[in-house]
């Protein structure tokens, strides 16, 4: 199974509606189905057309909380089972909570994607939010990864940083486990300096309404909301 | 696009003191850090303080705590710097600039200030 | 305070000669250096971002290293618009502070 079309992200205001495609292709034409933060999604309905060997599934939601939907495309060739998957999330517009309020715990990176990046033994921030925080952030971290080696050689290792730093945010441990956020400074320097043509492209889609998965990770948080390493060097994280 | 535009020349007597001004466009003024650098005739740069716009926090160099003071006002995107008991080594250009060292930098014209009797 | 020492204070030299301005950190500031340009009349230009990132736009003749406390600016082949001042910024911690700049001139 492949995925021809994956869904892309969006920025919505609370209580719209919002459409994700996702079109897969494989002998024999695939199955398709949804994930809402690591469970079968619970609410919106499913349409799926197939034509040709390809199978087009949209699935429509209406939106009253952020979350990740990963699009699964299965089939079965004699013996053998084929899956893709494709992820994006669902954010609301001024939606999201300060950090400390959000519900987690601290446990040991044991993903692959960020291996390179994050430090040996770091301890990450994992969100209950999700039903299977380690699988569905690894995932995010994946779907963005792949699409980050279309960008220039000086953006895509400050890219990645900034991502699986994003992502899996270092951990505070204590009574109330802590995601730290990046530095202000240094979503700036991938932003602006590192990453500045990619970050123009990404503007532009923004305006339009557009988001790519990986673009709109990039872009959350708004590096002005960050805390500064000069102003307060033990409430972020230096990459 | 980015622009930084600097109030005009000033000439100002010793023990006085001078505001200068930086009027922000083309950005979202609350979100990047305005720093203040100063280049005495024929001298190097030197680094007088920065402000947060959003909130208004600021840090300055030692030489001119006490003697310095840095505000924002949102409603009209500017920034302003104060410098109080001026003296004959306090004439220079003054530079308001966004974001030295780690976004994109621009540059507001500069403003001369010269401290005369 | 972090003390940066730039060597030398001036230079002269001819078109199409390697120059290497040296800038010294009183402590560590990791790579938390930027190069400026500064032509008479005119407001300084950023070249070098992060120590030996290059600015958009900046000729591939310049080039930055160094981490640390020891950092080099380095023209490859000088050209004529080359001959300016150049400052080197840490921007570690406040206060930050300008090394006390290099005057390039024709030899």
């Known amino acids: 199974a492949r995925i021809l079309r994956a869904p892309e992200s969006h920025n919505v205001t609370f209580g719209s509606f919002v459409t994700l495609h996702c079109t897969a292709t494989g002998i024999p034409v695939p199955t398709i189905t949804w994930i809402e933060n690591g469970n079968a999604v619970s609410s919106g309905s499913i349409q799926e057309s197939v034509k040709d060997r390809v199978i087009d599934s949209r699935l429509q939601l209406f939106i009253t909380k952020p979350g990740l939907y990963t699009c699964i495309a299965t089939n079965k060739h004699g013996e053998k089972f084929s899956t893709a998957k494709a992820a994006a999330t669902i954010s609301i517009a001024e939606w999201s909570k300060p950090q400390k309020d959000n519900k987690g715990y601290c446990a040991q990176y044991r993903g692959e994607v960020c291996n390179a990046v994050l430090a040996k033994d770091a301890l990450v921030f994992l969100n209950t939010s999700y039903a299977d925080p380690e699988e569905a952030q690894e995932l995010l971290v994946h779907t963005a990864w792949n699409e980050l080696k279309v960008v220039s050689p000086v953006c895509r290792p400050a890219a990645e940083a900034l991502l699986c730093n994003h992502i899996f945010q270092e951990c505070s441990p204590g009574v109330v486990p802590t995601p730290i956020p990046i530095c202000r400074e240094y979503c700036l320097a991938v932003k602006e300096l590192f990453c500045a043509k990619e970050w123009l492209v990404m503007e532009e889609k923004t305006h339009r309404g557009l988001y790519r998965s990986e673009m709109h990770l990039l872009s959350v948080p708004e590096c002005s909301k960050l805390p500064s390493m000069h102003w307060d060097p033990t409430a972020c994280a230096r990459l | 696009q980015v622009q930084l535009v600097q109030s005009g020349a000033e000439v100002k007597k010793p023990g006085a003191s001078v505001k200068v001004s930086c009027k922000a466009s083309?950005?979202?003024?609350?979100?990047?850090?305005m720093h203040w650098v100063r280049q005495a005739p024929g001298q190097g740069l030197e680094w007088m303080g920065i402000?947060?716009?959003?909130?208004?926090?600021?840090s300055y160099a030692q030489k001119f705590q006490g003697r310095v003071s840095m505000t924002s006002d949102t409603s009209t995107s500017t920034v302003s710097m104060e410098l109080s008991s001026l003296r004959s080594e306090d004439t220079a250009i003054y530079y308001c600039?966004?974001?030295?060292?780690?976004?994109?930098?621009?540059w507001g014209q500069g403003t001369l200030v010269t401290v005369s009797s | 305070d972090i003390q940066m020492t730039q060597s030398p204070s001036a230079m002269s030299a001819s078109v199409g000669d390697r120059v290497t301005i040296t800038c010294r950190a009183s402590?560590?500031?990791?790579?938390?250096l930027a190069w400026f340009q500064q032509k008479p009349g005119k407001v300084p230009k950023r070249l070098i971002y992060i120590a030996s990132n290059l600015q958009s736009g900046v000729p591939s003749r310049f080039s930055g290293s160094g981490s640390g406390t020891e950092f080099t600016l380095t023209i490859s082949s000088l050209q004529p618009e080359d001959f300016a001042t150049y400052y080197c910024?840490?921007?570690?911690?406040?206060?930050?502070?300008f090394g006390q700049g290099t005057k390039l001139e024709i030899k």
């Open positions: 402000i947060n716009p959003s909130g208004g926090s600021t």
């Open positions: 402590q560590d500031i990791r790579n938390y």
């Open positions: 083309g950005y979202t003024f609350t979100s990047y850090y």
């Open positions: 910024l840490q921007h570690n911690s406040y206060p930050y502070t």
């Open positions: 600039a966004r974001e030295l060292g780690w976004g994109s930098d621009y």
